[in-house]
């Protein structure tokens, strides 16, 4: 995705133009990938009755979904900008094996999947230009994210399903704790 | 290229009331946020109010129980009716839209409010 232009010279003329600060587009960025992930959980819970089964334990074995922890340094407890802001890069390529296994897995919200999927991307972007220490972000590995892939297709339906949902899930709880740490800085 | 054109700008009294409405034309892309900001003279840029495209709002501390934003998607318009105006409340609006799948963004001309007696 492209990343946005800095300041060009109708700023100078127009002080409203100035571009948004990047925080700024931080918080639109998360509070419209959540907005997303609203409505795709819509749809997940209207088609099957995932969102009250008591199962989830039996597909979680399969997911190793990141989570925020105390010693991410998220927490308003033992806040720690600079570990925490690589946390949530981390986490956020971390999942996005999972948001490319979602891009077929709705019918009417097909565009708003991909909506979540490309804003994810850019809000990635964004974060690393924050971040000081890129050395301590590892990258997932694109062979095990690729074998992942295609465990997870070879599920039968309520298994499919079922991780559906707990992506949906637990992308909206790290980006709500992200958003939360996101606003300290 | 995307247009953004704002109307119901003036004058109006202590206590009054407006509705502003910003109307979107050309290519827009239907995921986006769509808000106002707003900038008084000698005065830093703030955002006002903000809605995304499944109608989740946000709202500045200081127009909060004041000021509503709602859109009509089939439009592409947003609007911001402000009640219980405030002298502070004068500046100039400007619509804004944010577009997350690419991070780039849209404003508006910009339309003076004014709270005055």
């Known amino acids: 995705a492209p990343v946005p232009p800095g300041e060009d010279s109708k700023d100078v003329a127009a002080p409203h133009r100035q571009p948004l600060t990047s925080s700024e587009r931080i918080d639109k960025q998360i509070r419209y990938i959540l907005d997303g992930i609203s409505a795709l959980r819509k749809e997940t819970c209207n088609k099957s009755n995932m969102c009250e089964s008591s199962k989830e334990a039996l597909a979680e074995n399969n997911l190793n979904l990141p989570k925020m922890a105390e010693k991410d340094g998220c927490f308003q407890s033992g806040f720690n900008e600079e570990t925490c802001l690589v946390k949530i890069i981390t986490g956020l390529l971390e999942f996005e094996v999972y948001l490319e296994y979602l891009q077929n897995r709705f019918e009417s919200s097909e565009e708003q999947a991909r909506a979540v999927q490309m804003s994810t991307k850019v809000l990635i972007q964004f974060l690393q230009k924050k971040a000081k220490n890129l050395d301590a972000i590892t990258t997932p590995d694109p062979t095990t994210n690729a074998s992942l892939l295609t465990k997870l297709q070879a599920q039968n339906q309520w298994l499919q399903d079922m991780t559906t949902h707990l992506i949906l899930r637990s992308f909206k709880e790290f980006l709500q704790s992200s958003l939360r740490a996101l606003r300290q800085m | 290229q995307v247009k953004l054109e704002e109307s119901g700008g003036g004058l109006v009294q202590p206590g009054g009331s407006l509705r502003l409405s910003c109307a979107a034309s050309?290519?827009?892309?239907?995921?986006?946020?769509m808000g106002w900001y707003r900038q008084a003279p000698g005065k830093q840029r703030e955002l006002v109010a903000d809605i995304t495209n499944g109608g989740t709002t946000m709202y500045a501390d200081s127009v909060k129980g004041r000021f509503t934003i709602s859109r009509d998607n089939t439009k592409n318009t947003v609007y911001l009716q402000m009640n219980s105006l405030k002298p502070e409340d004068t500046a100039v609006y400007y619509c804004?839209?944010?577009?997350?799948?690419?991070?780039?963004?849209?404003w508006g001309q910009g339309a003076q409010v004014t709270v005055s007696s």
């Open positions: 804004h839209t944010y577009y997350p799948t690419t991070g780039f963004d849209d």
């Open positions: 050309g290519s827009i892309s239907r995921f986006n946020i």
